[in-house]
Amino acid sequence: FERTRSLQDPCSNCPAGTFCDNNRNQICSPCPPNSFSSAGGQRTCDICRQCKGVFRTRKECSSTSNAECDCTPGFHCLGAGCSMCEQDCKQGQELTKKGCKDCCFGTFNDQKRGICRPWTNCSLDGKSVLVNGTKERDVVCGPSPADLSPGASSVTPPAPAREPGHSPQ
């Protein structure tokens, strides 16, 4: 690495993956092992994140980018950058302080995380229940009874509908 010769801040020429070493006359030095700098002109390198315990490494740390973690099987990420791991539950359950519990009647959860949510109330849209809900699945709404012609074997979903029972978790 060459000594920087900038008329302004000599450190501005230090690229990502290096730091401006004040102890060595502001020479651009490579980041030490297990550290990184994602932008140029930095005076220190940041310590790499370590994915330990319930976290596992999704992307290794490099000299220019931090490690990225996800969760071991049976857990899922929460928070920005997977800052926490939370236990998975089965579909039809929600996580409580006492562990995974089945959804109460009239609620469902089609995910391995998140809470049990009430079934859709089809009548709010003037529609009828086409398929009953379960603890794993929401009800399916169909056209209003008045829309059904005699002998109609099936109906289409109400206007554009929303997607799988995913609710933000």
Epitope: D110, Q111, N121, V131, R137, P160, R162, G165, H166
Partner: antibody
């Protein structure tokens, strides 16, 4: 009538980036889940990502996690897919798809399927 | 390889009834709704069946869907030449936290 128009496809080198857009009309965009689905030439359909309108919650296929980012601008009726670190296996026609089941009344849209599709935009990844 | 298994091809003569299967597991088909799509050559997919067995308006009643356990089926009766297309099953998979498609069945009308 539901209309979805994708754009932004093209030729990009491995490791490069592209941003796809999908302009929606003919329905209340802010009330529906939206997905990207791709299809490599002569291959199967592969779901890529979904975004919900209410909470902005997103899900991704394992094959694109950490590289692709789905987003939406409800004020512009537009869906986006930012694709970084592109690989040869990402080459495909990318479709924008609208889910059935309008929110917030409908709690889950999985039952209703993807009831509106764009014509697709071709992404080629080659050096 | 797809999480949902479909036969790669199926065929029939005009007027016949053909059935296309889709096999999965308890984390997808077993506990979630199945949808079916038709993709005519050179076009985008079109929703054919939702919520296991229901047709959107405009889809002929020659198309029907059913589900039992961790498998689903699409039946097409009174086969027509315009039914020649690729047919895909799809559902939500809670363990993957994502949608999954079968790899499609190419239907040929002989």
């Amino acid at each position: 009538e539901v209309q979805l128009l994708e754009s932004g496809g093209g030729l990009v080198q491995p490791g490069g980036s592209l941003r796809l857009s999908c302009a929606a009309s003919g329905f209340t965009f802010s009330g529906y889940d939206m997905s990207w689905v791709r299809q490599a030439p002569g291959k199967c359909l592969e779901w890529v990502s979904v975004i919900y309108p209410d909470d902005g919650n997103t899900y991704y296929a394992d094959s694109v996690k950490g590289r692709f980012t789905i987003s939406r601008d409800n004020s512009k009726n537009t869906l986006y897919l930012q694709m970084n670190s592109l690989r040869a296996e990402d080459a495909a026609v990318y479709y924008c798809a609208k889910h059935g089941g309008q929110k917030p009344t409908t709690k889950s849209s999985s039952a209703y399927g993807m009831d509106g599709w764009g014509q697709g935009t071709l992404v080629t990844v080659s050096s | 390889q797809s999480v949902l298994t479909q036969p790669p091809s199926a065929s029939g003569t005009p007027g016949q009834r053909v059935t296309i299967s889709c096999s999965g597991s308890s984390s997808n088909i077993g506990n979630n709704y199945v949808t079916w799509y038709q993709q005519l050559p050179g076009t985008a997919p079109k929703l054919l069946i939702y919520a296991d067995s229901h047709r959107p308006s405009g889809v002929p009643d020659r198309f029907s869907g059913s589900k039992s356990g961790t498998s689903a089926s699409l039946a097409i009766s009174g086969l027509r030449s315009e039914d020649e297309a690729d047919y895909y099953c799809a559902t939500w998979d809670y363990s993957l936290s994502g949608y999954v498609f079968g790899c499609g069945t190419k239907l040929t009308v002989l």
